[in-house]
Interface confidence: medium
């Protein structure tokens, strides 16, 4: 028969042959042959693989470093990574929670919608058209663009969500 060019779900193609992938929590030891099945081994302690795979090495569980204010929220298994969170009163700097802040800053282009409290973190919002923030701040709201017209000036450079408009003198018509 013709060698396959594609395999079923949870299989992979190798040496013109469809082999079974290893299930989550196991790593590949050897590919299947005409006569043998794919050989897989369970991940070791503190390791995991979360998909059907042909990986020869399991991934290390994430380390929740107490020096960064992190602690374990959910212990990893052979099929799932460890989930970290921050010590009480601290907040994750990102969804991945790789470090902690007392309260998060809003990046340039974002303003503070709500300042952090003892229990809730800073809430940021994107600066809408007509407003900007050029700083990383845990307190500052988006500022409105300067109104050139009220200063009898014209817009020389348009504003963005991160920069104010640049005003300049009006062109005087020559006689």
């Amino acid at each position: 028969p013709e060698p396959p060019t594609a395999c079923r779900e949870k299989q992979y193609l190798i040496n013109s042959q469809c082999c079974s992938l290893c299930q989550p929590g196991q790593k590949l030891v050897s590919d299947c042959t005409e006569f043998t099945e794919t050989e897989c081994l369970p991940c070791g302690e503190s390791e995991f693989l979360d998909t059907w795979n042909r990986e020869t090495h399991c991934h290390q569980h994430k380390y929740c470093d107490p020096n960064l204010g992190l602690r374990v929220q959910q212990k990893g298994t052979s099929e799932t990574d460890t989930i970290c969170t921050c010590e009480e009163g601290w907040h994750c700097t990102s969804e991945a929670c790789e470090s902690c802040v007392l309260h998060r800053s809003c990046s340039p282009g974002f303003g503070v919608k709500q300042i952090a409290t003892g229990v809730s973190d800073t809430i940021c919002e994107p600066c809408p058209v007509g407003f900007f923030s050029n700083v990383s701040s845990a307190f500052e709201k988006c500022h409105p663009w300067t109104s050139c017209e009220t200063k009898d000036l014209v817009v020389q450079q348009a504003g963005t969500n991160k920069t104010d408009v640049v005003c300049g003198p009006q062109d005087r018509l020559r006689a």
Epitope: N67, G69, S99, V101, L102, H103, S105, V135, S136, F139
Partner: nanobody, 116 residues
């Protein structure tokens, strides 16, 4: 290397005043929002006050509003906290901070004790 050195703490009676200073070095001071935070004995860290890089905007925790004033002198790379009408509950180690990351640059702190 970033360094923050607080000073000005001490023992003061309730109702008294103190002025804390924080000398900064190793970074461009005026680029950063600066903060004061404190840790009371046996308690967690509490944010106290912050000031924008240019010094024009200030922010305070409700517990110190109207009593404490934050300021900065960018020409001297120094942050200040003027503390008036001090109460027993203001007793804490006060730290100035460049950013509020858990592991970021913090000073050693200066102890303020309010007691009669």
């Amino acid at each position: 290397e970033v360094q923050l050195l607080e000073s000005g703490g001490g023992l003061v009676q309730p109702g008294g005043s103190l002025r804390l200073s924080c000398a900064a070095s190793g970074f461009t001071f005026e680029w950063y929002e600066m903060q004061w935070v404190r840790r009371a004995p046996g308690k967690g860290l509490e944010w106290v006050s912050a000031i924008s890089g240019d010094g024009y905007r200030t922010y305070y925790a409700d517990s110190v509003k109207g009593r404490f004033t934050i300021s900065r002198d960018n020409s001297k790379n120094t942050l200040y906290l003027q503390m008036n009408s001090l109460r027993a509950e203001d007793t804490a180690v006060y730290y100035c901070a460049k950013e509020l990351l858990y592991f970021d640059y913090w000073g050693r702190g200066t102890l303020v004790t309010v007691s009669s």
